[in-house]
Amino acid sequence: EVEKTACPSGKKAREIDESLIFYKKWELEACVDAALLATQMDRVNAIPFTYEQLDVLKHKLDELYPQGYPESVIQHLGYLFLKMSPEDIRKWNVTSLETLKALLEVNKGHEMSPQVATLIDRFVKGRGQLDKDTLDTLTAFYPGYLCSLSPEELSSVPPSSIWAVRPQDLDTCDPRQLDVLYPKARLAFQNMNGSEYFVKIQSFLGGAPTEDLKALSQQNVSMDLATFMKLRTDAVLPLTVAEVQKLLGPHVEGLKAEERHRPVRDWILRQRQDDLDTLGLGLQGGIPNGYLVLDLSMQEALS
């Protein structure tokens, strides 16, 4: 708390300008009218206030707006945003994408802070869904943003927003998240032709079911091994050797290097050794010739 003291004669601030950087903390408290500060917040960021001085300015705004700042003030907080706590931010009603961008810019280059996470949460909740423009903005500042959302939160992403997603935005997504995103991507890109469709859908294939992988294998897509290794194991297991060969095209040779890793290892164990041998890659571990394969899951379903 800054002690209340009278403003010295002649020091009452008439405008928010550079002269204020020479004011001591108590002088700022005594001589700067909070309403003047609020109407001239857009000028604060151009003035090199110290962190201590910014504390005083924040205190003044808190007193003026105990229920939370209006958006015009929020939009021009600049470095003062770094002084805000998540509790402060929860009082805000941020509806403008310009405001969001302005505050994300302040935090640019840093990890997502609790303040930024709270701001984004308030913004997205206020909008009701993660629209394309918002997603564009958030992933531009935080490429890993999408993968920080829970599957429940991702369910509010409309398919149209998927166009904003870049491959690197999905790098840290787990299978549960891709399970939610894949159907949206499939819907978003459904009107594209084969090769263009595959380029767009590729990053989302970690959520694809077996039948979609089978369909892709008929389209000469030449999936690379990195993408194949990210596929759901349960989606890969039912694929035949022929289907995997068609799916990977010239990249099929890469299976040898990955034969000890999932999903390749588990897939090999489900294939007849005869079929694996047709690939000419020396893959071992398939079902020996003459053995009968019982699909117990199917048997349980029938009984």
């Epitope: 405008e15 300008d17 309403a35 109407t39 001239q40 857009d42 000028r43 015009s72 003030v73």
Partner: nanobody, 118 residues
Framework: EVQLVESGGGLVQPGGSLRLSCAAS????????MGWFRQAPGKGRELVAS????????YYPDSVEGRFTISRDNAKRMVYLQMNSLRAEDTAVYYC???????????WGQGTQVTVSS
């Protein structure tokens, strides 16, 4: 370039009221804020009221708080200053002003004289 033209000044008795008007040649919404300043003889120019264009947040110094009210009409490109309970110390030339985002008030009208005297 914006042009600001004030009107409504004059002679008024203490305790009386006046309404100043400011007509802007360009749209007032092009400016981050519009304001009224005054300058009494031998004194510096003083901001007495300002209003932000896009959300109507207002500011008044203690000397006029509760007595002066600033308002705007974007459609008519007008800014007003309603002055009530006028005092002798409110005597000054009153200037309409505008500013762009991040900048000081830098667009000024020619001023209108307000004299409070019995």
């Amino acid at each position: 370039e914006v042009q600001l033209v004030e009107s409504g000044g004059g002679l008024v008795q203490p305790g009386g009221s006046l309404r100043l008007s400011c007509a802007a040649s360009g749209s007032t919404s092009n400016y981050y804020a519009m304001g009224w300043f005054r300058q009494a003889p031998g004194k510096g120019r003083e901001l007495v009221a300002s209003i932000n264009s896009f959300d109507s947040i207002t500011y008044y110094p203690d000397s006029v708080e509760g007595r002066f009210t600033i308002s705007r009409d974007n459609a008519k490109r007008m800014v007003y200053l309603q002055m009530n309970s006028l005092r002798a110390e409110d005597t000054a030339v009153y200037y309409c002003a505008a500013r762009k985002k991040g900048l000081a008030f830098s667009y000024w009208g020619q001023g209108t004289q307000v004299t409070v005297s019995s």
